[in-house]
């Protein structure tokens, strides 16, 4: 299933992650998928 609004898939962690966390960790792999 696709990630819910405000989250993006992390290949590194194999789960959906909150885009909000990209403020603290902008280089996370999933941040590229965050608007």
């Amino acid at each position: 299933a696709p990630c819910s609004r405000g989250s993006s898939w992390s290949a590194d962690l194999a789960k959906c992650m909150d885009c909000a966390s990209c403020r603290a960790r902008p280089h996370s792999d999933f941040c590229l998928g965050c608007a």
Epitope: M17, R25, S28
Partner: antibody, heavy 119, light 111 residues
Framework: QVELVESGGGLVQPGGSLRLSCAAS????????MSWVRQAPGKGLEWVAE??????????HYAESVKGRFTISRDDSKNSLYLQMNSLRAEDTAVYYC??????????WGQGTLVTVSS | DIQMTQSPSSLSASVGDRVTITCRAS??????????MHWYQQKPGKAPKLLIK???NLESGVPSRFSGSGSGTDFTLTISSLQPEDFATYYC?????????FGGGTKVEIK
């Protein structure tokens, strides 16, 4: 399932030292920031210290109340977190919780270990 | 440091009641997109448990009767219909900057 297990608590005299440990399992430990949070008897929660990742050069941050006395560290090869506590004071008496989080909200918590500082 | 003021410090309620807990930060903890405010539940003798992150995102496995709202400095945790297992102490926490700080807690007791 995720598990964080603290150990090392106990009774120590004022001015003494103690080293807490936290063994982690069930998540990618090396990718998660880790903190210690404490709770004095009958009181609220207080953040104590944080350690970030190898890619952050294991950056550490401390509450003013423990700066210069406590040292947080981690060993990713052992999935373990530590808190070295020196120059302990009566006001450091608390249950100490190990917490894990990717960023921001503390997703994972241990059961806590009690530290009592008393003569 | 950002101060977190929770209210009330305690409340008595009955099963089925709607319960609202508020948390006020001494400065904004929000961007235009996200709020860096989180809510935890703690039962006696147990570790805290994350309920809601980023002001309104329900953690996996948390019942839908819990909800969070707010932005800027003012935030609310609501329990739409209080259940026996909800009697506990609730804490807010910001992650806007270091040091992270928690509210003083709200103890929800049985009326």
């Amino acid at each position: 399932q995720v598990e964080l297990v603290e150990s090392g608590g106990g009774l120590v005299q004022p001015g003494g030292s103690l080293r807490l440990s936290c063994a982690a399992s069930g998540f990618t430990f090396s990718s998660y920031w880790m903190s210690w949070v404490r709770q004095a008897p009958g009181k609220g929660l207080e953040w104590v210290a944080e350690i970030r990742l190898k890619s952050d050069n294991y950056a550490t941050h401390y509450a003013e109340s423990v700066k210069g006395r406590f040292t947080i560290s981690r060993d990713d090869s052992k999935n373990s977190l530590y808190l070295q506590m020196n120059s302990l004071r009566a006001e450091d008496t608390a249950v100490y919780y190990c917490t894990g989080y990717y960023a921001d909200a503390m997703d994972y918590w241990g059961q806590g270990t009690l530290v009592t500082v008393s003569s | 440091d950002i101060q977190m003021t929770q209210s009330p410090s305690s409340l008595s309620a009955s099963v089925g009641d709607r319960v609202t807990i508020t948390c006020r930060a001494s400065q904004s903890v929000s961007t235009s997109s996200y709020s860096y405010m989180h809510w935890y539940q703690q039962k006696p003798g147990k570790a805290p448990k994350l309920l809601i992150k980023y002001a309104s995102n329900l953690e996996s496995g948390v019942p839908s009767r819990f909800s969070g709202s707010g932005s800027g400095t003012d935030f609310t945790l609501t329990i739409s219909s209080l259940q026996p297992e909800d009697f506990a102490t609730y804490y807010c926490q910001h992650s806007w900057e270091i040091p992270y700080t928690f509210g003083g807690g709200t103890k929800v007791e049985i009326k």
